[in-house]
């Protein structure tokens, strides 16, 4: 059974992941982003189901495409270095989902824009955090 300290650690990691995802979304989904129109043409795979930490496998598999799109975003409004940012997210995701069990991600039929993709994973983080608090 999870201890209170491990639950607290999980919660903090999820909050960190949530902040990173929100910051990416804020940097992209605004009218001052000169590359927004182009960035919205890229398609991302969405999880068929995302209710448990193991489903973060679906996010992990889309981090490389996410980094490629973020490389377009360098501007006055996007000060984060995509490689560092994605690396940080990857570390958190690996810790959260664990590496003991292998989970095969199932994707939804419909692809999504980067904004829809980020919003989906933000909602996932908020949902899991709410069950922990």
């Amino acid at each position: 059974a999870p201890t209170s300290s491990s639950t607290k650690k999980t919660q903090l990691q999820l909050e960190h992941l949530l902040l990173d995802l929100q910051m990416i979304l804020n940097g992209i989904n605004n009218y001052k982003n000169p590359k927004l129109t182009r960035m919205l043409t890229f398609k991302f795979y969405m999880p068929k189901k995302a209710t448990e930490l193991k489903h973060l496998q679906c996010l992990e598999e889309e981090l490389k495409p996410l980094e490629e799109v973020l490389n377009l975003a360098q501007s006055k409004n996007f000060h984060l270095r995509p490689r560092d940012l994605i690396s940080n997210i990857n570390v958190i995701v690996l810790e959260l989902k664990g590496s003991e069990t292998t989970f095969m991600c199932e994707y939804a039929d419909e692809t999504a824009t980067i904004v829809e993709f980020l919003n989906r994973w933000i909602t996932f983080c908020q949902s899991i955090i709410s069950t922990l608090t």
């Epitope: 979304l25 804020n26 940097g27 001052k32 000169p34 933000i122």
Partner: antibody, heavy 122, light 111 residues
Framework: QVQLVESGGGVVQPGRSLRLSCAAS????????MHWVRQAPGKGLEWVAV????????YYADSVKGRFTISRDNSKNTLYLQMHSLRAEDTAVYYC???????????????WGQGTTVTVSS | DIVMTQTPLSSPVTLGQPASISCRSS???????????LSWLHQRPGQPPRLLIY???NRFSGVPDRFSGSGAGTDFTLKISRVEAEDVGVYFC????????FGQGTKVEIK
Amino acid sequence: QVQLVESGGGVVQPGRSLRLSCAASGFTFSSYGMHWVRQAPGKGLEWVAVIWYDGSNEYYADSVKGRFTISRDNSKNTLYLQMHSLRAEDTAVYYCAREEWFGEADYGMDVWGQGTTVTVSS
Amino acid sequence: DIVMTQTPLSSPVTLGQPASISCRSSQNLVQSDGNTYLSWLHQRPGQPPRLLIYKISNRFSGVPDRFSGSGAGTDFTLKISRVEAEDVGVYFCMQTTQFPTFGQGTKVEIK
């Protein structure tokens, strides 16, 4: 002094069109992004559209997408909002507002016009 | 869209007394450049909105120092240290971190 003056409002039937104008003076119009924001009678503020300082990008609220077009003529220091297929729910005071987002201060929407009233009614 | 929620919606105040308005956003408003694009606007009856505060706590030029803004992340506050007659009207919080959205407005009136 810095000023934005809207015009073009009026009473129009549902389904018809209208074009609003916003005349700018007292500042370098071509350095500023421009917004349209509306306010239905007795209600709050709703963002409608934005256009980049050079006209290169424009974005719209979902409620007006495909019906409204924002444009500008920097040589005339004028912003426009072309409105088609008007609905009763478009009835509002329409304000233009400026925003400089490549300056150091990042004030946001720091200057607003007095507004022009659009009434959509049969 | 980011949803902005203001409380209270109405605030009867006594002249010379303080007033406070809260604004909560549905998402963190920190932009990737480190700034938080949260503004406060004031609208008197029959007038257009007027910018009071930008980037959480910066007073716009000409705004009296009785107005102050604070907060971070998702929770923000506008305070008027001593309400004057000219302060009546509706106050809106607004975010431009993503596409602009406004709070519902808080009506400040004199008791």
